[in-house]
């Protein structure tokens, strides 16, 4: 079967109430079939490519475990399994200041060096 291209699927927006939790869905496809090398998953806020990171985790070669390296205020937790092309993120204890746009990103290293980031992101509305 032909190799898939890089793509990312995120909903335009997610709404939740302050104090509650929200899930920011993000799934992706990539052209590197059977890739099991080092992987980094990143979420950033504000703007793509340059906004501040709110979450980052890394998985070693051959591992499904994405070890959290950054979780802003300890409120961000990966629900999705990046090895299954899912970067869905849970945000706990929402505050009005969390009302912004979020962008997911995945990076491959090792034998393959490639990366991709959602351009439009998902808008989190906190009411």
């Amino acid at each position: 079967s032909p190799a898939q291209r890089w793509s990312m699927q995120v909903p335009p927006e997610v709404s939740a109430e302050a104090g509650d939790a929200a899930v920011l869905p993000c799934t992706f496809t990539h052209p590197h079939r059977h890739y099991d090398g080092p992987l980094t998953a990143i979420w950033r806020a504000g703007e793509p490519y340059a906004g501040p990171q709110v979450f980052r985790c890394a998985a070693a070669r051959g591992s499904e475990l994405c070890q959290t390296a950054l979780s802003l205020h300890g409120r961000f937790r990966l629900l999705g399994n990046p090895r299954r092309n899912d970067l869905s993120l849970r945000v706990e204890r929402l505050a009005l200041a969390d009302d912004r746009r979020y962008f997911c990103r995945v990076e491959f290293a090792g034998d393959v060096h490639d990366r991709y980031e959602s351009r439009h992101g998902v808008r989190l509305h906190v009411t």
């Epitope: 799934t27 079939r33 059977h34 890739y35 099991d36 070693a60 070669r61 051959g62 591992s63 499904e64 475990l65 070890q67 990966l78 629900l79 999705g80 399994n81 090895r83 299954r84 092309n85 899912d86 869905s88």
Partner: antibody, heavy 121, light 107 residues
């Protein structure tokens, strides 16, 4: 051949801790994730958490995060799962399982024989 | 957490007949479902991974299908040694979660 051999049955009192071991052989231990899964008598399977022995990184089911500690000793190819503040509902068979992979697919391909932990006053 | 609901809870099938077990996920889990067989006093044993892939050494009477939220394990011609409890498990989201199990017996 790949083998996971677990420690023997334990009887513990409520409030105590238990530490179950899982000795791996037949493969390169640091390369593969090891998960812990438990099964209460007559019940289904419940994933507790995982360790990547090569990095020592761990991930937990939130349900067990406060009470479970998963570790690994690469020098002896052994994974451990310690569960604290035991209660009667923790009576179960505890399994370790290797997360094998093939062409980018992951699965539990080898399991320990199980360790029965009984919590009773 | 993702809830995996199997149906039926138990199933009695004549030798040589087809057995079908369903598993429904509470949300889309792609094709990331495995099936395990467990016999009394033994650990689970992998049958099917990634919804449709038969694991090494598993007889071809076992097959899996489905994606999204609905998955099926089929035993095309039940043998005596297939009496066991069967579990589906999703690995798309953490924590990994299992179905409650389906007990397969001989009618």
């Amino acid at each position: 051949q790949v083998q996971l051999v677990q420690s023997g049955a334990e009887v513990k009192k409520p409030g105590a801790s238990v530490k179950v071991s899982c000795k791996a052989s037949g493969y390169t231990f640091p390369r593969y994730d090891v998960s812990w899964v438990r099964q209460a008598p007559g019940q289904g399977l419940e994933w507790m958490g995982v360790i990547h022995p090569g990095s020592g990184g761990t991930g937990y089911n939130e349900k067990f995060k406060a009470r479970a500690t998963i570790t690994a000793d690469t020098s002896t190819s052994t994974a451990y799962m310690e569960l604290s503040s035991l209660r009667s509902e923790d009576t179960a068979v505890y399994y370790c399982a290797r997360r094998g992979l093939n062409k980018g697919y992951w699965f539990f391909d080898f399991w320990g024989q199980g360790t029965l932990v009984t919590v009773s006053s | 957490d993702i809830v995996m609901t199997q149906s039926p809870d138990s199933l009695a099938v004549s030798l040589g007949e087809r057995a079908t077990i369903n598993c429904k996920a509470s949300q889309n889990v792609g094709s990331n479902v495995d099936w395990y067989q467990q016999k009394p006093g033994q650990p689970p044993k992998l049958l099917i991974y990634e919804s449709t892939n038969r694991y090494t050494g598993v007889p071809d009477r076992f097959s899996g299908s489905g994606s999204g939220t609905d998955f099926t394990l089929t035993i095309s011609s039940l043998q005596a040694e297939d009496v066991a409890v069967y579990y589906c498990m999703q690995s798309n989201f953490f924590p990994f979660t299992f179905g409650q199990g389906t007990k397969v017996e001989i009618k």
